[in-house]
């Protein structure tokens, strides 16, 4: 059916597959040494690893990609790993009247999946 | 800035950049000839294509993932291409009590950007 | 649930342009797949199909009618309208909408009625 | 444009029992893929058409199971196993092969 469940077990063996890893970052990894303050240094979470056949699907979207992937792998590109969901992040900054804290929704995976 | 502008125009030449392309999909290729009576064929819009650096990201994740993958190529992977949002599609499919339609939210992609 | 309602003048005289109107609820006219046809029902006969228009703006017109009949969408209000020129006597019938799933036609209006008098 | 042909009247027919209703088209129905394109809608008094069967053989969700239909790729039979007073009306069968879609004159099911 259009909803088979995603797979969960890794066929490649373990940390092959997608999942989420940590990325140790400073400032002036990411460039922003000249507006943020704190923290010096980020854990960034990344999702990383291969979507073999169905593991850890999005949706039904991906589902067919995979199947597809399959029939026809130079047409259709495999599902990769990227996030299903984010820790929300506080960077302390300047601004021009000072420094504030401001909230980043989006910047540090909590979760990942294939899409 | 966490924010800075994502890029539109792909340095790779045209249509190697992440993008939408329509693949078209037998109830057969998909393996739901069983259950689904209509559509016969489904025109699938997927996203394919390469994510050079800062192009459609998707959001501030993406950009740092873009980042880190210029530093560490081995350990951060680069973006790739995935769903924005997708067009609901209608499936008429085999019940238990006869045929019904049944709307799918997540089957077509819509439109592209690299996360 | 899926509604469909008609609406139309109710009388025209020879010559003149029917205006049809069908304004739908319970589903999106921006779904793959998805379409709202025209069909028409002279009294106590048979049913003829006149138009219908998918969900990416492609169009089927009758070949008899084709000439008279423009059919478009407004798929922000879930509207669809179907114009016929020049019309006769033999227009006058009860006029559906439809939805279309592919060859599947499963939800209809009500009807409205027109009747073509000098 | 494809030709469906049924005749007016059915034969009539008692509470309870069985009812069968013709329909012939002046092409083959059948398609290549194997679907037989053909539909039956009930028009009952003073209501719009209500899709019944569909692909031939395929009873839409919410019909009652007491509708069934067959037939070749030029000949089909709609059968109602008991029927009931609220199935009077008249029955249309209708071709999705090619455009446009076309319709019998429909068959008024009639009660004894």
């Known amino acids: 059916s259009a909803h088979a469940h995603p797979r969960d077990s890794c066929p490649l063996g373990p940390g092959r597959c997608c999942h989420l890893e940590t990325v140790q970052a400073t400032l002036e990894d990411l460039g922003w040494s000249d507006w943020v303050l704190s923290p010096r240094q980020l854990q960034l979470s990344m999702c990383v690893g291969e979507c073999p056949h169905l593991y850890r699907s999005a949706n039904t979207h991906a589902q067919i990609k995979a199947r597809l992937h399959g029939l026809q792998p130079d047409k259709v590109p495999a599902p990769c790993c990227v996030p299903s969901s984010y820790t929300p992040v506080v960077l302390m900054h300047r601004t021009d009247s000072g420094v504030s804290l401001q909230t980043y929704d989006d910047l540090v995976a909590r979760g990942c999946h294939c899409a | 800035s966490a924010h800075a502008h994502p890029r539109d125009s792909c340095p790779l030449g045209p249509g190697r950049c992440c993008h939408l392309e329509t693949v078209q999909a037998t109830l057969e290729d998909l393996g739901w000839s069983d259950w689904v009576l209509s559509p016969r064929q489904l025109q699938l819009s997927m996203c394919v294509g390469e994510c050079p650096h800062l192009y459609r990201s998707a959001n501030t994740h993406a950009q740092i993932k873009a980042r880190l993958h210029g530093l560490q190529p081995d350990k951060v992977p680069a973006p790739c291409c995935v769903p924005s949002s997708y067009t609901p599609v209608v499936l008429m499919h085999r019940t238990d009590s006869g045929v019904s339609l049944q709307t799918y939210d997540d089957l077509v992609a819509r439109g592209c950007h690299c996360a | 649930q899926v509604t469909l309602k008609e609406s139309g003048p109710g009388i025209l005289q020879p010559s003149q342009t029917l205006s049809l109107t069908c304004s739908f609820s319970g589903f999106s006219l921006s779904t793959y797949g998805i379409g709202v046809g025209w069909i028409r029902q002279p009294s106590g006969k048979g049913l003829e199909w006149l138009a219908h228009?998918?969900?990416?703006?492609?169009?089927y017109y009758n070949t008899a009618l084709k000439s008279r009949l423009t059919i478009s969408k407004d798929t922000s209000n879930n509207q669809v309208f179907l114009k016929i020129a020049s019309v006769d006597t033999a227009d006058t019938a009860t006029y559906y909408c439809a939805r279309l799933a592919y060859d599947y036609v499963d939800s209809w209006g009500q009807g409205t009625t027109l009747t073509v008098s000098s | 444009d494809i030709v469906m042909t049924q005749a007016a009247f059915s034969n009539p027919v008692t509470l309870g029992t069985s009812a069968s209703i013709s329909c012939r088209s002046s092409?083959?129905?059948?398609?290549?893929?194997?679907?037989?394109?053909l539909y039956w809608y009930l028009q009952k008094p003073g209501q719009s058409p209500q899709l019944l069967i569909y692909q031939m053989s395929n009873l839409v969700s919410g019909v009652p199971d007491r509708f069934s239909s067959s037939g070749s790729g030029t000949d089909f039979t709609l059968r109602i196993s008991r029927v009931e007073a609220e199935d009077v009306g008249v029955y249309y069968c209708?071709?999705?092969?090619?455009?446009?879609?076309?319709f019998g004159a429909g068959t008024k099911l009639e009660l004894k």
């Open positions: 228009i998918w969900w990416n703006d492609n169009k």
């Open positions: 092409k083959s129905l059948l398609h290549s893929n194997g679907i037989t394109y």
């Open positions: 209708a071709q999705n092969l090619e455009l446009p879609p076309t």
